[in-house]
């Protein structure tokens, strides 16, 4: 291990700078110019520089699990853990599930309504007495309820024509009822009798576009438990359908902006707010279905069985089960997705800050091992066949006494972990003897807490009247600076600077602000090595033959001189021995600028005065053409042609010189004039 | 990155001619300028030629009118064609390459002696 510190002063900042951290409280453990930052080492640093074991302050993290009898079946435990955490430093506890036999069960049978469901509403019907008889199999306490939805109320989900709104249905003739989007029809119940009677009662309905509105249902059954009754035992939500469904976005389609809010908006059993608010996303039904420990089973027909599959990856603790097209075979598709969500165990844990990271590792009845994964994970659990969680919690700073929940999804137990910061460091109490100190102050982990008025790392330095402020002052380069730059002690207004166990490194300079190191670095060396240059307070001196700001260049141009041995052609600078060119120049040497615009237009008027001593710089032809020089022979590079002052064309050529705006001209000894109407 | 191979070099009376080659490999598209520097005993080097990937050249007063820069093979060989040889262009000669920068690339170098 490892034992990053920053300006380190007392031994609780230490033990926050890593797990690796150790501090040493032995007297006179720093020698003079010794920082206290050097008392926080790893143990085997401070051993090797004579701290003595029981000198070494190393608070660890431990777990402490406390088991509550109290109370009916508990499938989970211990029901509580009390950490104290290190930073940096994991606390790990064990958590044993042991899945019960018999546990009590609601299950909420939620239907699609539109009208491709109808033969399906003729079977469900007569589902109740089935239901309950298939739920009393698995648990001596199972109670039924029924709800249904088709979708919002508005275009494009339903056809609002007045005739279509009464009556949905393709089939007129059909009694049929107006579409909804949620209706909660029965309150979770024992009696199939009811369950037969209120489920009787119900007409198919009917939409207009293919997905329905199943999330929004979903999301009222689950954050309305009052409402639908669920009890604090397993739950599950059969949702069945032979569609597609809406989510969040799909609103805008109605001119429906308003994020779902995740709130229950049931009023006389029916989601009358639906047109008001969007479709929830994925992520927070699941969210609010894991918060609420209900697990979805989606009864969807065999064209849809992939699509809902998909969405059991996002929902934890679902599954998917093949309906048959009139929904006939409901009872046993429901036993067999029961069974495989009670044997597969999530072990979980409610959102905490950044400040604590959990991992669990798992290991399961049948050998399977998952280590380091972000929550538990368990399948082919049996009845009283014990699992166990190993969980793993880290504080990554100091953290304020809180507490948070774990719990398998779809249960009720939880496990309630409380966290406490292990940061205090334990000293032998020698406060009493303030000799140490020169009498003027106490000793608190080998280090001297002064009385006021005395300063010091023994408290040796009388303030004589000036504040510690006012010393510390002299102390520090300007008012923002900390004293001594954080690299020396403040003795008596003076920096006394840290000798650095980094060798070749010297703190130094009134205010300690200097060292012999931190200077930009090449070839992994403080400015380039001995041989290139020293550092000296923050900058590179470089010896003769090396410049750059870590002493990284040689001090030559030859990369930088073209075939006249022009510096960058007179249009750049060089630095380092490579050209920085000005804009719009190319390296290596600033020769092309194939950006720049064509320099014709610009010389028409110095090639009409330098060959024919005419045009608007006729007069002073030199001082206004300054970059030109007229060649009596044919010049190699731009050919122009332009017309004058006189509107006759003019053919010439320019040749770049070096520098900027220098150019060889070459202009044809024939115009072309035009001659204009008579 | 780029490897570039010189040959053609070798011993030629005053007043002969040599033709040296530059083959480059590797990442070679993105080269818009290639250079023929030369070394003599004792002295600098010197750049002499110049040729851009727009195709225009530079040369150093010396051996202007003697020498001539080109490049072949889509810009992958450039030759430096010397005539008219002199004893003062007794040196090595290195062909150097730059990639949309500064010169980065150097070929190992090619003997040219111009005996008296």
């Known amino acids: 291990q490892e034992c990053t510190k920053f300006k380190v002063s007392s031994c609780r900042e230490c033990i926050e700078s890593g797990p690796g951290c150790t501090w040493c409280q032995k007297l006179n453990f720093t020698g003079p110019g010794d920082p206290d930052s050097i008392r926080c080492d790893t143990r085997p640093q401070l051993l090797m520089r004579g701290c003595a074991a029981d000198d070494i302050m190393d608070p660890t993290s431990l777990a402490e699990t406390q088991e509550d009898h109290n109370g009916g079946q508990k499938q989970l435990s211990p029901q509580k853990v009390t950490l104290y955490l290190r930073p940096g430093q994991a606390a790990a506890f064990n958590v044993t599930f042991r899945r019960a036999k018999g546990y009590p069960i609601d299950l909420y049978y939620l239907m699609d309504l539109s009208y491709s469901m109808l033969d399906d509403l003729r079977n469900v019907k007569k589902l109740g007495g089935d239901l309950l008889r298939a739920l009393n199999e698995i648990t001596e306490s199972g109670r039924i309820g029924f709800g249904s939805f088709v979708d919002k109320t508005v275009l494009p989900f339903v056809n609002t024509h007045p005739d279509k709104l009464r009556n949905p249905c393709p089939n007129k003739e059909k009694e049929c009822q107006p579409p909804f989007a949620f209706r909660h029809v029965l309150k979770l119940t024992n009696n199939s009798n009811q369950f037969q009677t209120e489920v009787g009662k119900q007409l198919i309905s009917g939409n207009l576009d293919a997905p329905e509105g199943g999330l929004d249902a979903m999301m009222q059954v689950a954050a309305c438990p009052e409402e639908i009754g669920w009890r604090n035992v397993t739950r599950l939500l059969v949702f069945a359908t032979d569609d597609g469904f809406h989510f969040a976005g799909d609103g805008k389609l109605g001119a429906i902006l308003t994020p779902n809010d995740g709130r229950c908006h049931l009023e006389d059993n029916l989601y009358k707010r639906s047109n008001e608010f969007d479709y929830p996303s994925v992520g927070q039904l699941a969210h609010k279905l894991a918060e609420n420990n209900i697990q979805p089973i989606f009864a969807v027909t065999s064209r849809m069985v992939k699509t809902y599959e998909k969405l059991t990856e996002i929902i934890p603790k679902s599954a998917v089960g093949e309906l048959s097209e009139d929904s006939s075979n409901v009872v046993h598709l429901i036993k067999n997705a029961y069974n495989k969500l009670s044997s597969r165990v999530f072990l979980d844990h409610n959102a905490l800050p950044d400040t604590l990271k959990v991992t669990y590792d798992s290991f399961c009845s049948n050998g399977v091992t998952h280590r380091n994964q972000p929550r538990g994970d368990c399948d082919g659990v049996q009845i009283n066949v014990p699992i166990t969680f190993q969980v793993k919690v880290t504080a990554t700073e100091c953290i304020q006494e809180q507490s948070f929940v774990i719990r398998a999804l779809g249960f009720t137990d939880i496990v309630t972990v409380q966290v406490l910061p292990q940061c205090e460091c334990r000293c032998r109490d020698q406060s009493r003897d303030r000799s140490l100190c020169h009498g003027k102050g106490f000793l608190e982990c080998g280090i001297c807490r002064c009385d006021t008025g005395y300063i010091g790392k023994n408290c040796e330095c009388q303030t004589q009247g000036r504040s510690s402020q006012e010393l510390e002052g002299s102390c520090r380069k300007d008012n923002n600076s900390i004293i001594c730059s954080g690299l020396g002690d403040c003795v008596c207004g003076q920096c006394l600077c840290h000798t650095s166990d980094v060798p070749g490194k010297l703190i130094y300079g009134q205010y300690c602000e200097c060292d012999t190191i931190n200077c930009e670095r090449y070839n992994g060396q403080v400015c380039g090595g001995p041989g290139r240059g020293l550092c000296f307070c923050g900058k590179c001196r470089c010896h003769p033959g090396f410049e750059g700001s870590a002493c990284q260049c040689e001090r030559t141009t030859e990369g930088c001189l073209n075939p006249r041995r022009v510096e960058c052609s007179g249009r750049g600078r060089c630095r380092c021995n490579v050209c920085e060119c000005h804009s719009g120049y190319q390296l290596p040497l600033c020769q092309e600028c194939p950006g720049c615009p064509s320099p014709c237009g610009k010389y028409i008027s110095c090639a009409e005065c330098l060959k024919f001593e005419k045009g608007p710089f006729g007069k002073n032809c030199s001082a206004a053409c300054p970059g030109l020089q007229l060649s009596n022979n044919p010049v190699k590079g731009r050919t122009c042609k332009e017309r004058d002052s006189e509107g006759c064309w003019v053919a010439y050529t320019l040749e770049q010189q070096d520098g900027m705006d220098r150019y060889l001209i070459y202009v044809d000894e024939s115009r072309e004039c035009v001659a204009g109407p008579n | 990155e780029v490897q570039l191979v010189e040959s053609g070099g070798g011993l030629v009376q005053t007043g002969g001619s040599l033709r040296l080659s530059c083959a480059a490999s590797?990442?070679?598209?993105?080269?818009?300028?290639w250079g023929w520097y030369r070394q003599a005993p004792g002295k600098q080097r010197e750049l002499v030629a110049v040729i851009s990937s727009s195709g225009s050249t530079d040369y150093s007063d010396a051996v202007k009118g003697r020498f001539t820069i080109s490049t072949v093979n889509a810009g992958n060989t450039v030759y430096l064609e010397m005539n008219s040889l002199k004893p003062e262009d007794t040196a090595v000669y290195y062909c150097?390459?730059?990639?949309?920068?500064?010169?980065?690339?150097w070929g190992q170098g090619s003997q040219v002696t111009v005996s008296s």
């Open positions: 590797g990442s070679t598209f993105n080269i818009n300028a």
């Open positions: 150097r390459a730059a990639d949309s920068g500064p010169w980065r690339y």
